[in-house]
Interface confidence: low
């Protein structure tokens, strides 16, 4: 078991690509990617399912194209695309990466998504190796990406078929005494040929050095693309020793049904129009074998061959290919200003302070039916309800008899007297103020605010 990981680095017009986007007339959009893995390098079975697995990326940031502006690299979704595989990693595989464009404007008469580009690579790759980089052209577009396969413990090895047993395991049969701890049974990786590139080479037998795709040489140090003669076909030139151009794999356009041809080392690749698949775009129509249902949709054969499949979408998705996330929050199910969260499998409402319930329907701060005792009045505000209590009472519901002097509010030795409308401080000599907080100078003038008219230092100060 293990995981195939794909990292998309950029997607945009290739060199000499479209001067401006062919989609510029449309409104805001965002990209997402679909990856499909098929075992083996065979060119047959173009319609075979993604037997090794498939994955769909998150949607990328929203991008609004400027009608006359050059098409830039389009903003990409974050994160890796990960395709778990259950069984052995086959080593040779076909990697299909589809770039999809999701329209966000009002869509009239058609799906809100379209396939921008589809690249298919046939590759050899050992599990546990480093990231392999690639650049692929699809029509006017260029896709840059890296990928790798890694095993998940306890599986190890280039095919993830060897099971690694940690040292602590023991191998005793039933009823036998415990054995001595085993030596680590995880096989050490074979020692490759001295100097074999750690990045671009790998080995399965000691002393060998096998190169990852795109690298060559005895130590896998030479990138295939650096050869000065690469890409030229035909008879050898006597002057340079290089090949002179001959007929190319795209000559005569082997791509059927309007597919566009791009050359790959020693071969060609067809970028097919919508509704066509296969090495030469020769497969028309889409069936369940193509894996057309996104987001975990279940594909079944349609009763009508003009729609040869039907996608049964999981909760939270809709569209003929389950490609559209249902915006269940647009119905504003959360009341009282609650924040709506669509978790895919369920809706959640994050309620504002003072509200509760699955849809924030319960107002915890509601004065309705909430009595304040002992003549207190209920006041709503600040996201909470409170009782404004009559004098002499306190607490959340004004049920507690309040002693205004309990908190010893009179400073500098002033004495506190409970009063029908609050409390009164009788200040010690030399202090004045509602709480006896201000010292009085010997000349009878206060150091801070002037005493209110009619009050002299030492008089009781009433604190409302």
């Amino acid at each position: 078991a293990g995981v195939f990981e794909l990292q998309i680095h950029s997607f945009g017009p290739g060199p000499g690509g479209a001067p401006r986007s062919p989609y510029s007339a449309r409104g805001p959009c965002r990209l997402f990617f679909r990856v499909c893995l098929k075992p083996g390098l065979s060119e047959e079975a173009a319609e075979s399912p993604c037997a090794l697995g498939a994955a769909l990326s998150a949607r990328g940031p929203v991008y609004t194209e400027q009608p006359e502006a050059p098409a830039p690299d389009l903003p990409l979704p974050n994160g890796l695309l990960q395709v778990p595989f259950r069984d052995a990693w086959p080593g040779t595989f076909s990697l299909i990466i589809e770039t999809w464009r999701e329209e966000l404007g009002d869509q009239i008469g058609g799906p809100a998504w379209s396939l921008l580009a589809r690249v298919t690579r046939r590759r050899r790759l050992a599990a546990g190796g480093p990231w392999a980089g690639d650049i692929q052209r699809a029509g006017a577009w260029e896709l840059r990406f890296s990928y790798r396969a890694r095993c998940e413990l306890p599986a190890v090895g280039t095919a993830c078929t060897r099971l690694c047993r940690p040292r602590s395991a023991s191998r005793c049969g039933p009823g036998l005494r415990p054995c001595a701890p085993l030596e680590d049974e995880c096989e050490a990786p074979p020692v490759c040929r001295a100097g074999c590139s750690l990045e671009h080479g790998f080995c399965e037998q000691p002393g060998e050095c096998r190169c990852l795709e795109g690298w060559t040489g005895p130590l896998c140090m030479v990138p295939v693309s650096t050869s000065s003669c690469l890409g030229l076909r035909g008879p050898s030139s006597t002057t340079t020793g290089c090949l002179v151009p001959g007929p190319g794999p795209c000559d005569g356009n082997p791509c059927a049904n309007g597919g566009s041809c791009s050359e790959t080392p020693g071969s060609f690749e067809c970028t097919c129009p919508r509704g066509f698949y296969g090495l030469r775009c020769e497969v028309s129509g889409v069936t369940c074998a193509d894996g057309p249902c996104f987001n975990g949709g279940l594909c079944v054969g349609g009763a009508d061959p003009d729609s040869a499949y039907i996608c049964h979408c999981p909760p939270g998705f809709q569209g003929s290919n389950c490609e559209k996330r249902v915006d269940r929050c647009s119905l504003q199910p959360c009341r009282n200003g609650g924040l709506c969260l669509d978790l895919g499998h369920a809706l959640r409402c994050r309620c504002r302070a003072g509200f509760a319930g699955p849809r924030c329907e319960h107002d915890l701060n509601d004065c309705a039916g909430r009595a304040c005792a002992n003549g207190g009045t209920c006041v709503e505000g600040g996201g909470a309800h409170r009782c404004s209590c009559a004098l002499g009472f306190g607490g959340r519901d004004c049920r507690e008899r309040a002693d205004p002097c309990a908190a010893r509010p009179c400073a500098h030795g002033g004495r506190c007297y409970a009063h029908f409308s609050g409390l009164v401080c009788a200040c010690a000599p030399g202090y004045m103020g509602a709480r006896c907080e201000f010292p009085v100078h010997p000349d009878g003038v206060s150091a801070l605010p002037a005493a209110p008219p009619g009050l002299r230092p030492g008089d009781p100060q009433r604190y409302p």
Partner: antibody, heavy 116, light 107 residues
Framework: EVNLEESGGGLVQPGGSMKLSCVVS????????MSWVRQSPEKGLEWVAE??????????HYAESVKGKFTISRDDSKSRLYLQMNSLRPEDTGIYYC???????WGQGTLVTVSA | NIVMTQSPKSVSMSVGERVTLSCKAS??????VYWYQQKPEQSPKMMIY???NRYTGVPDRFTGSGSATDFTLTIRSVQAEDLADYHC?????????FGSGTKLEIK
């Protein structure tokens, strides 16, 4: 109920032209790729041409034998499919059927006879 | 072009018998194969799509099978109303092509 009804067939001289029409009801015409298929005793069933949707810019495909001679078109607002046939030859004789793209729905056919 | 070859050219069966019609493609067409029934003086009618899917309203005595190059239409218990020509066709690649048909006659 799905119904496709062809019209416009008849007798035409070699080298002549003819335009077939097909009116569709019972399904959303604008959502379907459409084709013309012909049938003759000599050649049996023979696919002639296909037209896709507005979202595909009404892309068309033709059998090699009619390329450059026949033109398929559609009018989604009228749910109509057309086949303009030029430079007709005797081997173009047959019953012409209007069909949905994977031939689930068929009209009753219209007979085209190319003869001097 | 992909050639679809049907056999036999014609077959005569009694009511209640089982009949098997064959269609061979000149190259791999996956499961993009269709079977049509054409009764005298009528237009073809779809019976099977995707090699093995029975079309809406088609009786379950009709069964399609096969993939790649060899395809079969089986009628489990032939009825008098099954008298017709049966055509296979492929939509795997352009141009779409049809077989020349098998005529089913009832004894």
């Amino acid at each position: 109920e799905v119904n496709l009804e062809e019209s416009g067939g008849g007798l035409v001289q070699p080298g002549g032209s003819m335009k077939l029409s097909c009116v569709v009801s019972g399904f959303t015409f604008s959502n379907y790729w459409m084709s013309w298929v012909r049938q003759s005793p000599e050649k049996g069933l023979e696919w002639v041409a296909e037209i896709r949707l507005k979202s595909d810019n009404y892309a068309t495909h033709y059998a090699e034998s009619v390329k450059g001679k026949f033109t398929i078109s559609r009018d989604d607002s009228k749910s109509r499919l057309y086949l303009q046939m030029n430079s007709l030859r005797p081997e173009d004789t047959g019953i012409y059927y209007c069909t949905s793209n994977r031939f689930a729905y068929w009209g009753q056919g219209t007979l085209v006879t190319v003869s001097a | 072009n992909i050639v679809m070859t049907q056999s036999p050219k014609s077959v005569s069966m009694s009511v209640g018998e089982r009949v098997t019609l064959s269609c061979k493609a000149s190259e791999n067409v996956g499961t993009y194969v269709y079977w049509y029934q054409q009764k005298p003086e009528q237009s073809p009618k779809m019976m099977i799509y995707g090699a093995s899917n029975r079309y809406t309203g088609v009786p379950d005595r009709f069964t399609g099978s096969g993939s790649a190059t060899d395809f079969t239409l089986t009628i489990r218990s032939v009825q008098a109303e099954d008298l017709a020509d049966y055509h296979c066709g492929q939509s795997y690649s352009y141009p779409f092509t049809f077989g020349s048909g098998t005529k089913l006659e009832i004894k």
